[in-house]
Interface confidence: medium
């Protein structure tokens, strides 16, 4: 049966919900899938279910709620129906489903190189996603930077920060690194997708190498 896979708000002003539409062998044709939503109010004695306002904008098997249909103040309930019967249902508040778009415009600058030329420190900078209204205070984002050597599989995670730049220390100068950043709403929601990977190549800085490394 169709099931909700994800509801997501990128900026607390709109949201969309997605569902699977797999037809399993041996199951009868369910007919067209419809999404209905309601906001719970006890004074509306019969819950007022309304159909999805926009099945197109968020892609296939989805429903998009623009800013006219989105409010942070009260939870939503949504249900998937087919042939008049409910096949899946869930309730949430908008703040619970916030997943920001990826940070953008990643770049790096060299901070310093060790005396031996073996290690270097860099400063990584990025920008908040365009639709996260940081200036207005409408979203307060927390960022997580991860980095690794290109040939490694495991990412090193840095502690979450509220700023849009962070120093990364003691990288090996003869290696190439991948850096990526993701963000989440502070004290709420889940991390969004990672940014595009930033490649950091630190060319060899000196002709000699040394067993010990002094700064």
């Amino acid at each position: 049966e169709p099931k909700f896979t994800k509801c997501r708000s990128p900026e607390r002003e709109t949201f969309s919900c997605h569902w699977t539409d797999e037809v399993h062998h041996g199951t009868k044709n369910l007919g067209p899938i419809q999404l209905f939503y309601t906001r719970r109010n006890t004074q509306e004695w019969t819950q007022e279910w309304k159909e999805c306002p926009d099945y197109v904008s968020a892609g296939e098997n989805s429903c998009y709620f623009n800013s006219s249909f989105t409010s942070i103040w009260i939870p939503y309930c949504i249900k998937l129906t087919s042939n008049g019967g409910t096949v899946d249902e869930k309730c949430f508040s908008v703040d619970e489903i916030v997943q920001p778009d990826p940070p953008i415009a990643l770049n790096w600058t060299l901070l310093n190189v060790s005396l031996t030329g073996i290690h270097a420190d860099i400063q990584v900078r990025w920008e908040a996603p365009r639709n996260a209204d940081i200036q207005k205070g409408w979203m307060v984002l927390e960022y997580e930077l991860q980095y690794k050597e290109v040939n490694e599989t495991k990412w090193k995670m840095m502690d979450p920060i509220l700023t849009t730049s962070v120093p990364v220390y003691s990288l090996k100068v003869d290696k190439e690194y991948e850096v990526r950043v993701r963000s989440k709403q502070r004290n709420s929601g889940n991390y969004g997708e990672f940014s595009e990977v930033l490649y950091v190549t630190l060319p060899q800085m000196s002709q000699f190498t040394c067993e010990e490394d002094f700064y």
């Epitope: 906001r39 109010n41 004074q43 409010s71 939870p75 205070g137």
Partner: antibody
Framework: EVQLVESGGGLVQPGGSLRLSCAAS????????IHWVRQAPGKGLEWVAY????????SYADSVKGRFTISADTSKNTAYLQMNSLRAEDTAVYYC????????????????WGQGTLVTVSS | DIQMTQSPSSLSASVGDRVTITCRAS??????VAWYQQKPGKAPKLLIY???SLYSGVPSRFSGSRSGTDFTLTISSLQPEDFATYYC??????????FGQGTKVEIK
Amino acid sequence: EVQLVESGGGLVQPGGSLRLSCAASGFNVSSYYIHWVRQAPGKGLEWVAYISSYYGYTSYADSVKGRFTISADTSKNTAYLQMNSLRAEDTAVYYCARWSGTSEYYWPAFDYWGQGTLVTVSS
Amino acid sequence: DIQMTQSPSSLSASVGDRVTITCRASQSVSSAVAWYQQKPGKAPKLLIYSASSLYSGVPSRFSGSRSGTDFTLTISSLQPEDFATYYCQQSYHSFLITFGQGTKVEIK
């Protein structure tokens, strides 16, 4: 008992600054949205700004955006409204009010208000 | 922006009268409307929230209702202490809260 007490109002010249305080008791400001609402003499109510100190969210009316800053100090259980570049049209009684909070069944409203503090902008 | 158009701006009534004040939202606001009472020199007091829910401690002669984008505050039998100014307010919009212009209820 829930109580909100505003202070910091007074007479200020156009272009001047003032900082209003809203001391809360009987609840934690970190658990609620705190709003400022103003009322010009003989006029209606105008929403000014709100803050959620837990999430760090703030929002402002267009008429004060870029000039006013709302903040909160959870250790003092107090919200603030920093008002810069004040204009004659900012003259009003300023109220802080508590937003009743998000519920599964009800839309929120201002359930508690302070007594108000008068801000007069005049040369 | 969502406008809340309140009417009438003032009305004269007698004790015991049934009084109706209306507010029309410029777009759908679900049931996200509250009503407040304000007396001169005092802070507003919450009467009705979520369009029709009576706030704790408010007399039952006050009631609220909704029909689409039209909201109504009714005082079934006006009492001497009810002479005041009444405001509607929408809280549907997540980052912009708006009030109606107010209705002054005066003694006839």
